[in-house]
């Protein structure tokens, strides 16, 4: 299977995750890494040209560096 | 099932702006961590990729030609949108959107062929 | 940006032998690398995805695999249909780079 295995959702299920089981969506990398991998975001040093850490509520568009966001885990479902 | 169908003008002249669609079908992108990519393939020529936009409306572009391009969705009819401003003939070359799901594009559309000539 | 070394750029083969094609990362990608297939008419397919995990109704005669920054296709037993375009894309960092492709004809 390419995903992590769905069922339909009760009140206290997990969401469902594009990742197989034992990764997780990594929301700075914008993929599944293994979940002991996900990154948090680090400040940036002086002069760097990525754009500023972006939240939920501030989008920004990019053209290359890592999103900003803090990573989300979301394990596959087992 | 997944489908992704791109259109496109066709045929355009040098310094117009291109603008490409792609409507998709069995997924939706207010899912979390989806999303829609754009490809383009000159004819005979490898794979270039331009532009990614996410259900949180975050998007990234290929720096060599981000001042050219825009990313934008609308997610209620299902659509993805990519404009590219100032075409050259450099530009000439089919263009592919795909579905972005956990471990990048899983599936791609038909593709779209676009010629600028004068 | 990563660029990714595809090698052959072309590759001569005859029904039923095993055939390799190599990517090779500029930086370290970790394994996010996914190798497509193009048909002649344009029509565009993941096989692989994460360097070695078969997508769903991929033929299990493809194979990935990874050696430190070379990543190969391996198909185990060409069949008339495996004659096409193949591509890696690594998915690690954006810009998101593919490889330069390998055209795989017959013999």
């Known amino acids: 299977m390419r995903r992590g295995p769905r069922s339909l959702r009760g009140r206290d299920a997990p969401a469902p995750t594009p990742c197989v089981p034992a990764e997780c969506f990594d929301l700075l990398v914008r993929h599944c890494v293994a979940c002991g991998l996900l990154r948090t975001p680090r400040p940036k040093p002086a002069g760097a040209s990525s754009p500023a850490p972006r939240t939920a509520l501030q989008p920004q568009e990019s053209v290359g560096a890592g999103a900003g966001e803090a990573a989300l885990p979301l394990p596959g479902l087992l | 099932q997944v489908t992704l169908k791109e259109s496109g003008p066709g045929i355009l002249q040098p310094s117009q702006t291109l603008s490409l669609t792609c409507s998709f079908s069995g997924f939706s992108l207010s899912t979390f961590a989806m999303g829609v990519g754009w490809i383009r393939q000159p004819s005979g020529k490898g794979l270039e990729w331009l532009a990614h936009?996410?259900?949180?409306?975050?998007?990234y572009y290929n720096p060599a030609l981000k001042s050219r391009l825009t990313i934008s969705k609308d997610t209620s009819n299902h659509q993805v949108f990519l404009n590219i401003a100032n075409v050259d003939t450099a530009d000439t070359a089919t263009y592919y959107c795909?579905?972005?799901?956990?471990?990048?594009?899983?599936?791609w559309g038909q593709g779209t062929t676009l010629t600028v000539s004068s | 940006d990563i660029q990714m070394t595809q090698s052959p750029s072309s590759l001569s083969a005859s029904l039923g032998e095993r055939v390799s094609l190599t990517c090779r990362a500029s930086?370290?990608?970790?394994?996010?690398l996914n190798w497509l297939q193009q048909k002649p008419d344009g029509t565009i397919k993941r096989l692989i995805y994460?360097?070695?995990t078969l997508d769903s109704g991929v033929p299990k005669r493809f194979s990935g695999s990874r050696s430190g920054s070379d990543y190969s296709l391996t198909i185990s037993s060409l069949q008339s249909e495996d004659f096409a375009d193949y591509y890696c894309?690594?998915?690690?960092?954006?810009?998101?780079?593919f490889g330069g492709g390998t055209k795989l004809e017959i013999k």
């Open positions: 795909g579905r972005t799901y956990g471990y990048d594009v899983d599936y």
């Open positions: 894309l690594q998915y690690a960092s954006y810009p998101r780079t």
């Open positions: 930086q370290e990608i970790s394994g996010y």
């Open positions: 936009i996410w259900w949180d409306d975050v998007k």
């Open positions: 994460a360097a070695s």
